[in-house]
C-alpha cells in the first residue's frame, strides 16, 4: 500500500511534470512565437485512455517527437534547451510510471496538434494530483 511519503513524492513529481508541460505550452502557444503555425503541422498521438500513472507510457513514447517540435522554437521561449527539457520530463515520467511493469500504450484513432497534446497531458496531471490531495 502506498505510504503518505510515497504519495507526497508522487504528488511533487506530478506537479513538476505539470509545470514543465505548462511552461512548454505557454512558451509556444502565443502569437509572438514565430514558429507557432509550423509547429501546429506536427502530428501527435493521443492515449485512448489516460487515468492511471502507467498510462504515462503513452507520453514517454511521444517525447522524441515533442523534442523535434521544440527544436523549431526559439531558445528564449524556454529556460532550458529542448534536449534538456525533454530529458528532465523523461526522468520524471519513468519514475512515475515505474519500470517494473511493461504497459503497451493504446492510442486513439484521432491525432492531435502539439497544443491539444500538451493540454491532454496537463489535464491528466491535474486529474491525478486531485485524487492524491
Amino acid at each position: 500500500a502506498p505510504t503518505s511519503s510515497s504519495t507526497k513524492k508522487t504528488q511533487l513529481q506530478l506537479e513538476h511534470l505539470l509545470l514543465d508541460l505548462q511552461m512548454i505550452l505557454n512558451g509556444i502557444n502565443n502569437y509572438k512565437n514565430p514558429k507557432l503555425t509550423r509547429m501546429l503541422t506536427f502530428k501527435f498521438y493521443m492515449p485512448k485512455k489516460a487515468t492511471e500513472l502507467k498510462h504515462l507510457q503513452c507520453l514517454e513514447e511521444e517525447l522524441k517527437p515533442l523534442e523535434e517540435v521544440l527544436n523549431l522554437a526559439q531558445s528564449k521561449n524556454f529556460h532550458l534547451r529542448p534536449r534538456d527539457l525533454i530529458s528532465n520530463i523523461n526522468v520524471i515520467v519513468l519514475e512515475l510510471k515505474g519500470s517494473e511493469t511493461t504497459f503497451m500504450c493504446e492510442y486513439a484513432d484521432e491525432t492531435a496538434t502539439i497544443v491539444e497534446f500538451l493540454n491532454r497531458w496537463i489535464t491528466f496531471c491535474q486529474s491525478i494530483i486531485s485524487t492524491l490531495t
Partner: antibody, heavy 119, light 108 residues
C-alpha cells in the same frame, strides 16, 4: 469582416523594382504573422516569404532571397513586398496570406495581384 | 528539397466520388491541409489537420491520412467543385512550407 486587400501589381521590365501592398481589416493585424505566396501562370502555389507579427523576424524562399524584402506597418495595418532585380520567372499572381494562430496553415488570403516581368 | 506529389488531373461525373491523393515522406508525423482554388480566385482551405473541415465547407469534403499518403475525398462531386486542389504541409523538420503541384478536378 476579415479581409486582405492587395494593390501594386503591374508590368515591369527585368531588373526593375516593384512594391506590393496588402491592407488588412476586420482583425487585429499586429497579432498575426503574415506571408506572401505566388502562383506563376498555369502553375502551382509557391510560398515566398514570412514576417512575424512585429516585423522583427523574416524568412524567404531561396528563389527570392537577397532580391525581395517583406515589411509591415502595424499602425497602418499594411503588409508590403518590395521586389528588386525582377526576373521573367518572377511573373506570377502574388497573394498575401495570414498565418493562423490555431492551425498550421494560411487561413485568410488576399485577392491576388498580377506581376508581369517582361521587356 | 521536400516535395508533395499529386496527380495533375482528375475527371469525374457529377454525383461521383472524387479522390485526390498527396504523397509526402513526412506525413506519418505531419498534418495535411487541402486548398481549393477556383479559376481566377484565391485559395480556400477545405480540410485541415488531415480530417477536419472548416466551418462553411460542405460535408461532402473529407480528408484522411495513412502512412505517407494524404487523401482528399469529395463524395458526390458537384459542378461547382470543379477547381484546382492543392495539398499543403511542412517538411520533416517543420522548417519549409510546401505545396503539392496541384490537381485539376474536372466535373462534367
Amino acid at each position: 469582416q476579415v479581409q486582405l486587400v492587395q494593390s501594386g501589381g503591374g508590368v515591369v521590365q527585368p531588373g526593375r523594382s516593384l512594391r506590393l501592398s496588402c491592407a488588412a481589416s476586420g482583425f487585429t493585424f499586429s497579432n498575426y504573422a503574415m506571408n506572401w505566396v505566388r502562383q506563376a501562370p498555369g502553375k502551382g502555389l509557391e510560398w515566398v516569404t514570412f514576417i512575424t507579427y512585429d516585423g522583427h523576424w523574416k524568412n524567404y524562399a531561396d528563389s527570392v532571397k537577397g532580391r525581395f524584402t517583406t515589411s509591415r506597418d502595424n499602425s497602418k495595418n499594411t503588409l508590403y513586398l518590395q521586389m528588386n532585380s525582377l526576373r521573367a520567372e518572377d511573373t506570377a499572381v502574388y497573394y498575401c496570406a495570414r498565418d493562423s494562430t490555431t492551425l498550421g496553415a494560411f487561413d485568410v488570403w488576399g485577392q491576388g495581384t498580377m506581376v508581369t516581368v517582361s521587356s | 528539397s521536400y516535395e508533395l506529389t499529386q496527380p495533375p488531373s482528375l475527371s469525374v461525373s457529377p454525383g461521383q466520388t472524387a479522390t485526390i491523393s498527396c504523397s509526402g515522406d513526412a506525413f506519418p508525423r505531419k498534418f495535411a491541409y487541402w486548398y481549393q482554388q477556383k479559376s481566377g480566385q484565391a485559395p480556400v482551405l477545405v480540410i485541415y489537420e488531415d480530417t477536419r473541415r472548416p466551418s462553411g465547407i460542405p460535408e461532402r469534403f473529407s480528408g484522411s491520412s495513412s502512412g505517407t499518403m494524404a487523401t482528399l475525398t469529395i463524395s458526390g462531386a458537384q459542378v461547382e467543385d470543379e477547381a484546382d486542389y492543392f495539398c499543403y504541409s511542412t517538411d520533416t523538420t517543420g522548417t519549409h512550407r510546401v505545396f503539392g503541384g496541384g490537381t485539376k478536378l474536372t466535373v462534367l
